[in-house]
């Protein structure tokens, strides 16, 4: 049994890091493998992560962690029984994938304005709380070409757009994702999408 693709990990910079790897053949990850991990400098026992299958030869492990700080550096040991398959390290602050925003809501009761709000996925005491910026994706269910991205570069988790920038009388969906420039993170996953019917009074045109 060998590791074909070495584990790569990303951290949500809060409580979970996710590591993925591939074995050289079909593997029952949860029964055959264990990933041991701990802060390299910490006087403590190792934590054990039981991996799950992620495709035939792929494995994924969700590592539970204390609140992360920039100094943190983890040692990882991948074991198959008594055989050490791989040894590595992982610094969460250098591989951050933020949590996805939640509770995306479209408020249509403001006159001719759409107000989209969502929740910051981090508690106020987390470093990323004040460092997230967002991308909002709005698309038409009827017209695949009607697809737009709004970059929200301010901290407030909301976006205001004129209803008239979208077509009237049809259904739209929206979703939002986050990233943090300070840690050069990857984008988060998209939030679950929310749907609304866009309708507004078109201005009367005189000919």
């Amino acid at each position: 049994m060998k590791v074909l693709q070495e584990p790569t990990c990303v951290s949500d910079y809060m409580s979970i890091s996710t590591c993925e790897w591939k074995m050289n053949g079909p593997t029952n990850c949860s029964t055959e493998l264990r990933l041991l991990y701990q802060l390299v400098f910490l006087l403590s026992e190792a934590h054990t992560c039981i991996p799950e299958n992620n495709g035939g030869a792929g494995c994924v492990c969700h590592l539970l962690m204390d609140d992360v700080v920039s100094a943190d550096n983890y040692t990882l040991d991948l074991w198959a029984g008594q055989q050490l398959l791989w040894k590595g390290s992982f610094k969460p602050s250098e591989h951050v994938k933020p949590r996805a925003p939640g509770n995306l809501t479209v408020h249509t009761n403001v006159s001719d304005t759409l107000l989209l709000t969502w929740s910051n996925p981090y508690p106020p005491d987390n470093y990323l709380y004040n460092h997230l910026t967002y991308a909002v994706n709005i698309w038409s269910e009827n017209d695949p070409a009607d697809f737009r991205i709004y970059n929200v570069t301010y901290l407030e988790p909301s976006l205001r757009i004129a209803a008239s920038t979208l077509k009237s009388g049809i259904s739209y969906r929206a979703r939002v994702r986050a990233w943090a420039q300070c840690y050069n993170t990857t984008w988060s996953e998209w939030s679950p999408s929310t749907k609304w019917h866009n309708s507004y009074r078109e201005p009367f045109e005189q000919h």
Epitope: F41, L42, S44, E45, K87
Partner: antibody
């Protein structure tokens, strides 16, 4: 029973070397951090260093170069190799298991005397 | 090197007294709370009392408590018992892998 038992202490001449052993039972060294602490007669506790579950070692600045921590997973035993010993290294040497950033389990200690 | 300074170095107290020992670190400990307290009696190995500044170790009586954050920490014995006469040590934890001890505080019978 979960315990640590040190051995290997004794009288050694200045400049000499000594290797202390610490046998662990009831838990596995390859999934724990374990370290060494010493205490000179009538003095306080002094941190020497530790080895983490993955075999990475850390040392107090004063111990770097002269002291080496290692382990044998097959014997579930921790070692402390001490070289170029001096009179001021005379102390009781304890091995201890790490937990949540502290030492939660200690051996009974072994006395090392450096004297001519 | 990082220094852990305990005060007082020794104290005399009576059974039933409230006793407070302080520990000051020259640098903030890891996550502001990686600070442990130990009790040691003559000829015996140290015993863990408190870990991560305020958590009581298994089997330790509730009269022992710890508090503090960053560089300043306190061990309190709410009502001193005869078996509590001993020497107490603090120990800081750092992301450099250093775990220095304080010099100790000897609690003696008045």
């Amino acid at each position: 029973e979960v315990q640590l038992v040190e051995s290997g202490g004794g009288l050694v001449q200045p400049g000499g070397s000594l290797r202390l052993s610490c046998a662990a039972s009831g838990f596995s060294l390859n999934s724990n951090a374990v370290g060494w602490v010493r205490q000179a007669p009538g003095k306080g506790l002094e941190y020497i260093g530790f080895i983490n579950f993955s075999g990475i070692t850390y040392y107090a600045n004063w111990a770097k170069g002269r002291f080496t921590i290692s382990r044998d997973n097959s014997k579930n035993t921790l070692y402390l190799q001490m070289n170029s010993l001096r009179a001021e290294d005379t102390a009781v040497y304890y091995c201890a298991r790490g937990s949540a950033g502290s030492f939660d389990l200690w051996g009974q200690g072994t006395l090392v005397t450096v004297s001519s | 090197d990082i220094q852990m300074t305990q005060s007082p170095s020794s104290l005399s107290a009576s059974v039933g007294d409230r006793v407070t020992i302080t520990c000051q670190a020259s640098e903030s400990v890891y996550k502001n709370n990686y600070l442990a307290w130990y009790q040691q009696k003559p000829g015996k190995a140290p015993k863990l009392l408190i870990y991560r500044a305020s958590n009581l170790a298994s089997g330790v009586p509730s009269r022992f408590s710890g508090s503090g954050s960053g560089t300043d920490f306190t061990l309190t014995i709410s009502s001193l018992q005869p078996e509590d006469f001993a020497t107490y040590y603090c120990q800081g934890g750092y992301s450099s892998g250093m775990y220095p001890f304080g010099q100790g505080t000897k609690v003696e019978i008045k």
